[in-house]
Amino acid sequence: APTSSSTKKTQLQLEHLLLDLQMILNGINNYKNPKLTRMLTFKFYMPKKATELKHLQCLEEELKPLEEVLNLAQSKNFHLRPRDLISNINVIVLELKGSETTFMCEYADETATIVEFLNRWITFCQSIISTLT
């Protein structure tokens, strides 16, 4: 059974992930970002279902494509290089989803833009955090 300390750790990790995703979204949505049109041509894949931490597998599998899109963006839109930013997110995702169980991600048929993709995972983090508090 989860202890209060492990719940607290999970909550902090989710909050960190949430902040990273929000930072990326803000950098992309920045009105000075001339790359938005080009970035929106990239297709992202969304999970059919995202209600548990194990579903973060679906986010992990899309981190490389996310890094590619961020490589297009002006570096001044973000505090970190895309590679470092994605690496940080990857570490949190791996800790949150755990490595004990191998979960096969199921993807929805429709693709999403980077903005829709980030918003979906931001909502996921907020929803899990709310169940922990």
Partner: antibody, heavy 121, light 113 residues
Framework: EIQLQQSGPELRRPGSSVKLSCKAS????????IHWVRHRPEHGLEWIGW????????RYAQKFQSKATLTADTSSNAAYMQLSSLTPEDTATYFC??????????????WGQGTLVTVSS | DIVMTQSPFSLAVSEGEMVTINCKSS????????????LAWYQQKPGQSPKLLIY???TGQSGVPDRFIGSGSGTDFTLTISDVQAEDLADYYC?????????FGAGTKLELK
């Protein structure tokens, strides 16, 4: 028809620099990234970097970071690459390239004919 | 960076034969979301620019003869040329375009026996 027309061969002394051009036709240069690739027969193909002509943003492979400088001029629908501090190892054919219509960055589908740069004293 | 290991270095063939060129990546090039492998194959003839033959590991580029077949997934890929023609003698390169920097294999020279 999409074409990338590159400038002619160059002979340079070690220590000097050279600027190559790549003129696009059949599409607007701001719609796609322009990549540069080096070919040396004994080393094969190496990606140098890309430029987004829309805003001049660039990305370089680490080994070319201080060797190549990519620029673009939207008014002439052309991209340029300057190579500095030339050494005999920079002797190669340099290609500019563009992605497929359906893919935003890679793979390279349209290529210039290449520019041979020879560095010799 | 992703390392692409291509083999063999060179290959001597007779017209009409079938040849296979292999390419191994240091990490998976498969994107789970669309089940596509971000690997391309190029042909380069002496004095010419490279020509895209195959992308997404198995999709033939428009106008490329169907004797060029790409296969494989994850980290192991193959370019098969069935019924080799004299005009196929060239250098062949694989390219991973999953993540920047894109990286090429060292190349395979196809020669006539």
């Amino acid at each position: 028809e999409i074409q990338l027309q590159q400038s002619g061969p160059e002979l340079r002394r070690p220590g000097s620099s050279v600027k190559l051009s790549c003129k696009a036709s059949g599409y607007n240069i701001t719609d796609y990234l322009i990549h540069w690739v080096r070919h040396r027969p004994e080393h094969g193909l190496e990606w140098i970097g890309w430029i987004d002509p829309e805003d001049g943003e660039t990305r370089y492979a680490q080994k070319f970071q201080s060797k190549a400088t990519l620029t673009a001029d939207t008014s002439s629908n052309a991209a340029y690459m300057q190579l500095s501090s030339l050494t005999p190892e920079d002797t190669a054919t340099y290609f500019c390239a563009r992605s497929l219509d359906s893919t935003p960055i890679y793979p390279f589908a349209y290529w210039g004919q290449g520019t041979l740069v020879t560095v010799s004293s | 960076d992703i390392v692409m290991t291509q083999s063999p270095f060179s290959l001597a063939v007779s017209e009409g034969e079938m040849v296979t060129i292999n390419c191994k990546s240091s990490q998976s090039l498969l994107r789970s979301g669309n089940q596509k492998n971000y690997l391309a194959w190029y042909q380069q003839k002496p004095g010419q620019s490279p020509k895209l033959l195959i992308y997404y590991a198995s999709t033939g580029q428009s106008g490329v003869p169907d004797r060029f077949i790409g296969s494989g997934s994850g980290t192991d890929f193959t370019l098969t040329i069935s019924d080799v023609q004299a005009e196929d003698l060239a250098d062949y390169y694989c390219l991973q375009h999953y993540i920047t920097p894109p990286t090429f294999g060292a190349g395979t020279k196809l020669e006539l026996k």
